[in-house]
C-alpha cells in the first residue's frame, strides 16, 4: 500500500492557507478536481470542486475556499481564506476519474489553526496587493457525491503536537453555492 504522508500547515485565525497541488498536465489537465476533508474513520468529504471539465485558470469559490486550476502548468491552487480554529483538520486534493477511484494529489495537508491574528495576510504571503474580486453571481455546485469505499481509510495517527479535528462542520457558507470569479482582461 502507498504510504500516505502528511504536510503540516500551522496558521493563525484570519490567515490564508495557500496550497499548490501538482499534477501531470498531459493526463489530468481537464479532469475535475476537488478539495476534501478527511475525518477519522469517515469517507473523505468534498468541500469544493472545479467544473467538469475543469476550466483553465477560472477561479471557483465555495464559501471561504477558492480553487484555481492552471491547465498550462499542471497545478491546482487551493486557498482557504479567513481561517478559523474549527477549520483545523486533515485535507487532500483529488482528481475525479470515474469510474476509477479519485486520484489523490500531493501530500495530505494537516491544517492547524490557532487563535490570535498575526496581522499578516497569510503565513506564506508578502503580497503588495491581495484583492479578491468576487462578483455577485452564483451557480449550483456540481461536485460528485460518490467516494469509492476503498478510499475510506483510518487517518494516520496524529502527532502529539497536532490539534484534533473538531466535531463541528467547517464553517463555510452554503456549499451548494459556487461563485465563479472571472479573469479580468
Amino acid at each position: 500500500a502507498t504510504k500516505l504522508t502528511e504536510e503540516k500547515y500551522e496558521l493563525k485565525e484570519g490567515q490564508t492557507l495557500d496550497v499548490k497541488c501538482d499534477y501531470t498536465l498531459e493526463k489530468f489537465a481537464s479532469s475535475q478536481k476537488a478539495w476534501q476533508i478527511i475525518r477519522d474513520g469517515e469517507m473523505p468529504k468534498t468541500l469544493a470542486c472545479t467544473e467538469r471539465p475543469s476550466k483553465n485558470s477560472h477561479p471557483v469559490q465555495v464559501g471561504r475556499i477558492i480553487l484555481e486550476d492552471y491547465h498550462d502548468h499542471g497545478l491546482l491552487r487551493v486557498r482557504m481564506v479567513n481561517l478559523q480554529v474549527e477549520d483545523s483538520g486533515l485535507y487532500q486534493c483529488v482528481i475525479y476519474q470515474p469510474p476509477k477511484e479519485p486520484h489523490m494529489l500531493f501530500d495530505r495537508i494537516r491544517l492547524v489553526v490557532t487563535k490570535g491574528f498575526s496581522g499578516t495576510p497569510g503565513s506564506n504571503e508578502n503580497s503588495t496587493q491581495n484583492v479578491y474580486k468576487i462578483p455577485p453571481t452564483t451557480t449550483k455546485a456540481l461536485c460528485p457525491l460518490y467516494t469509492s469505499p476503498r478510499t475510506v481509510t483510518q487517518a494516520p495517527p496524529k502527532s502529539t503536537a497536532d490539534v484534533s479535528t473538531p466535531d463541528s462542520e467547517i464553517n463555510l457558507t452554503n456549499v451548494t453555492d459556487i461563485i465563479r470569479v472571472p479573469v479580468f482582461n
Epitope: 504536510e7 503540516k8 499548490k20 501538482d22 499534477y23 483553465n56 485558470s57 492552471y70 498550462d72 502548468h73 499542471g74 497545478l75 500531493f106 501530500d107 503565513s123 506564506n124 504571503e125 508578502n126 503580497s127 503588495t128 496587493q129 491581495n130 484583492v131 479578491y132 474580486k133 479573469v183 479580468f184 482582461n185
Partner: antibody, heavy 116, light 107 residues
Framework: EVQLVESGGGLVQPGGSLRLSCAAS????????MSWVRQAPGKGLDWVAS????????YYVESVKGRFTISRDNAKNSLHLQMNSLRAEDTAVYYC?????????WGQGTLVTVSS | EIVMTQSPATLSVSPGERATLSCRAS??????LAWYQQKSGQAPRLLIY???IRATGIPARFSGSGSGTEFTLTISSLQSEDFAVYYC?????????FGGGTKVEIK
C-alpha cells in the same frame, strides 16, 4: 510555440530607472501568471516578482519592494517591469517567464547593467 | 525565507554514467519543488515539477524524487547535451527561492 521576447535593458547609472517589457505569444497570456527572474553575471537564478492574470495578486522579493513594479497589459499580451532607484546589485540578465510559482517557459533575457 | 542548498557544487561525470544531484530545503516544501537545466549562454528550461513529474518533452532519463526537505534529480545515463548547470526551486512559499546550482561537467 511559446515565445517571450524581452526588451528595454541597457546601461544605467545608480539611482536611475529602466522599464523592461516582454512581448508574449503562442499561449493564452490572459490565463497565465507571469514573472520576472534575474541572473547576475556568473551567478545563480533569483526570482524578482510575479503577477496574477488580473493583477489582483502581486508578489516581490524583499530586495526590490518599493523600487520595482510589475504590471501587465492583457490586451497587448505584454508584461512590464518598472525599475527605479537602481543599484549596482541589480545588474543581471532579466528573464520574462510564464508561470507564477514555477516557470514553464523563459525568454532569452535582457541585460541590465547598473554602473557609474 | 526558505533557503535551498544544492550539492555538490560541481559534479564530474563520464557520458553514459548516472548523475545524482541533491537539493535540501531549510524547511519542508512538501512536493512543491522544481528542477531546471541551464546550458551556457541559454535560458533555463523546466525539467521536473512537483518533485517528480517530468515537464512536457523532457526525456525519461531525467527523474526526480523526494518530499519535504530532501530532493534528488537523477540523470540515468548522461548524454553530451546534458552537461549543464542544474537548479532546484521551491514554490511552496513566497518568496520563491532557488538553490545555488550544480554544474555537471564532463569527466
Amino acid at each position: 510555440e511559446v515565445q517571450l521576447v524581452e526588451s528595454g535593458g541597457g546601461l544605467v547609472q545608480p539611482g536611475g530607472s529602466l522599464r523592461l517589457s516582454c512581448a508574449a505569444s503562442g499561449f493564452t497570456f490572459s490565463s497565465n501568471w507571469m514573472s520576472w527572474v534575474r541572473q547576475a553575471p556568473g551567478k545563480g537564478l533569483d526570482w524578482v516578482a510575479s503577477i496574477k492574470q488580473d493583477a489582483s495578486e502581486i508578489y516581490y522579493v524583499e530586495s526590490v519592494k518599493g523600487r520595482f513594479t510589475i504590471s501587465r497589459d492583457n490586451a497587448k499580451n505584454s508584461l512590464h517591469l518598472q525599475m527605479n532607484s537602481l543599484r549596482a546589485e541589480d545588474t543581471a540578465v532579466y528573464y520574462c517567464v510564464r508561470g507564477g510559482w514555477r516557470f514553464e517557459s523563459w525568454g532569452q533575457g535582457t541585460l541590465v547593467t547598473v554602473s557609474s | 525565507e526558505i533557503v535551498m542548498t544544492q550539492s555538490p557544487a560541481t559534479l564530474s561525470v563520464s557520458p553514459g554514467e548516472r548523475a545524482t544531484l541533491s537539493c535540501r530545503a531549510s524547511q519542508s516544501v512538501s512536493s512543491n519543488l522544481a528542477w531546471y537545466q541551464q546550458k551556457s549562454g541559454q535560458a533555463p528550461r523546466l525539467l521536473i515539477y512537483g518533485a517528480s513529474i517530468r515537464a512536457t518533452g523532457i526525456p525519461a532519463r531525467f527523474s526526480g524524487s523526494g518530499s519535504g526537505t530532501e530532493f534528488t534529480l537523477t540523470i540515468s545515463s548522461l548524454q553530451s547535451e546534458d552537461f549543464a548547470v542544474y537548479y532546484c526551486q521551491q514554490y511552496k512559499n513566497w518568496p520563491l527561492t532557488f538553490g545555488g546550482g550544480t554544474k555537471v561537467e564532463i569527466k
